[in-house]
Interface confidence: low
């Protein structure tokens, strides 16, 4: 903690400006008014303060707002956000998506820190659920965000938020997570027509049951092999050769290259050889 000392004559800061980078730590403590700092936080980011100087500024804000910073200050924290502990952030009430974006921008390119995790927690708690706009923002900064949540957590995501999910956001999701997300996606996209529906639902199909795959096979969707390989094995096994042929369309030839890998391998073993022969791919059951 910085020792309390009187401000030297003529050094009292009338505003937050570049001259403050020449102040020693004790001078910043003595000569910068905390209320002034709070109202001019937006200027701090433009001034190349040292980490030690930022520590002093944080200390001043902590003294001014012992119960937690107001959102007007939080929104303009900039790099000072990196100085905050999860304990500091737990005192905040962040409700504006603009504030969340501003702080995530500061951490951009870095792994999700405990500070960011706590900030997101506070924000989502304030909103009551992980809504579409929030999910849009979070996945833009952390494409793997959705897949970092447990199935239990994902169950609180409303179907309307699924519109914000991009295919790459699901790249690292495991089958249990897709089991939770797929019914939500099915609900979210239910009013779309066949081809548009398939484009949207495709990335979620790792959670689809057999009956939905059978229904898709009747719609000329031409599923690519990459999507087929991500389907649940237990959902693929009951499909007939004719259904798989319809589901994959022209991509059915790709089964040969994948015949040793699940779920193709397990599916082949469940089929009658004369049914497999109708594909003309030389698949051996």
């Amino acid at each position: 903690e910085v020792e309390k000392t009187a401000c030297p004559s003529g050094k009292k800061a009338p505003e937050i400006d570049e001259s403050l980078i020449f102040y020693k730590k004790w001078e910043l403590e003595a000569c910068v008014d905390a209320a002034l700092l709070a109202t001019q936080m937006d200027r701090v980011n433009a001034i190349p303060f040292t980490y030690e100087q930022l520590d002093v500024l944080k200390h001043k804000l902590d003294e001014l707002y012992p119960q937690g910073y107001p959102e007007s200050v939080i929104q303009h924290l900039g790099y000072l956000f990196l100085k905050m502990s999860p304990e500091d952030i737990r005192k905040w009430n962040v409700t504006s998506l603009e504030t969340l974006k501003a702080l995530l921008e500061v951490n951009k390119g870095h792994e999700m820190s405990p500070q960011v995790a706590t900030l997101i927690d506070r924000f989502v708690k304030g909103r009551g659920q992980l809504d579409k706009d929030t999910l849009d923002t979070l996945t833009a900064f952390y494409p793997g965000y959705l897949c970092s949540l447990s199935p239990e957590e994902l169950s609180s995501v409303p179907p309307s938020s699924i519109w914000a999910v991009r295919p790459q956001d699901l790249d690292t999701c495991d089958p249990r997570q897709l089991d939770v997300l797929y019914p939500k996606a099915r609900l979210a996209f239910q009013n779309m027509n066949g081809s548009e529906y398939f484009v949207k639902i495709q990335s979620f199909l790792g959670g689809a049951p057999t009956e939905d795959l059978k229904a898709l096979s009747q719609q000329n969707v031409s599923m690519d092999l990459a999507t087929f390989m991500k389907l649940r094995t237990d959902a693929v096994l009951p499909l007939t050769v004719a259904e798989v042929q319809k589901l994959l369309g022209p991509h059915v030839e790709g089964l040969k290259a994948e015949e040793r890998h699940r779920p193709v391998r397990d599916w082949i073993l469940r089929q009658r050889q004369d049914d497999l022969d109708t594909l003309g791919l030389g698949l051996q059951g």
Epitope: P86, A117, I120, D121, V124
Partner: antibody, heavy 123, light 112 residues
């Protein structure tokens, strides 16, 4: 599946310290907090403290001077240490997961509990 | 600290009956965000407590729908619509709105 397994001594001498390790599986300590609770016939269930996912701690003021909670995320272990034990600290000590990480509240229920460590303070 | 008072201390019931347990807090459990962090646990003999209901009325995964929670502010109730043998044990209410988190003294559900 989510599990919390506790290891620690059953008998502690008066004025000595108690150390318990809670090893978790099925979830990451980076995402979830862990609480410590004790239960004795005389005082019922008492919340002792918590270590949050970010590593910060909150303690029950009644125990703050002699309680320390820490963790090693990479080993999935949470460490509980209480000093200067007396006979009335005899209890069953539990670790429990804070049922919420990034999108749920940090002030949530304790959704999974360890099997408990029975501690007797006696010479 | 917030004091949690449960009534009754003991609740003798017949299997198939409805059971109701009350929990009262010494101060409001409404958090600054508007959520109320009041939870219910069941502890069977020789076991750790298990979460039944979180945030007043939300059933935890795997908890049968015969369990329901209600209440607001300082007064809360746990109801079991048709008691089964596996429901016997000690029920605790708990608050996590204020630090330190605190628990009720427990209500023992037993066969009449």
């Amino acid at each position: 599946q989510v599990q919390l397994k506790q290891s620690g001594p059953g008998l502690v001498q008066p004025s000595q310290s108690l150390s318990i390790t809670c090893t978790v599986s099925g979830f990451s300590l980076f995402s979830y907090g862990v609480h410590w609770v004790r239960q004795s016939p005389g005082k019922g269930l008492e919340w002792l403290g918590v270590i949050w996912s970010g590593g910060s701690t909150d303690y029950n003021a009644a125990f703050i001077s002699r309680l320390s909670i820490s963790k090693d995320n990479s080993k999935s272990q949470v460490f509980f240490k209480m000093n200067s034990l007396q006979a009335d600290d005899t209890a069953m000590y539990y670790c429990a997961r804070n049922g919420g990480s990034m999108i749920t509240t940090l002030y949530y229920a304790m959704d999974y509990w360890g099997q408990g460590t029975s501690v007797t303070v006696s010479s | 600290d917030v004091v949690m008072t449960q009534t009754p201390l003991s609740l003798p019931v017949s299997l198939g009956d409805q059971a109701s347990i009350s929990c009262r807090s010494s101060q409001s459990l409404v958090h600054s965000y508007g959520n109320t962090y009041l939870h219910w646990y069941l502890q069977k003999p020789g076991q750790s407590p298990k979460l039944l209901i979180y945030k007043v009325s939300n059933r935890f995964s795997g908890v049968p729908d015969r369990f329901s929670g209600s209440g607001s502010g300082t007064d809360f109730t746990l109801k079991i619509s048709r008691v089964e043998a596996e429901d016997l044990g000690v029920y605790f209410c708990s608050q996590s709105t204020h630090i330190p988190f605190t628990f009720g003294g427990g209500t023992k559900l037993e066969i009449k």
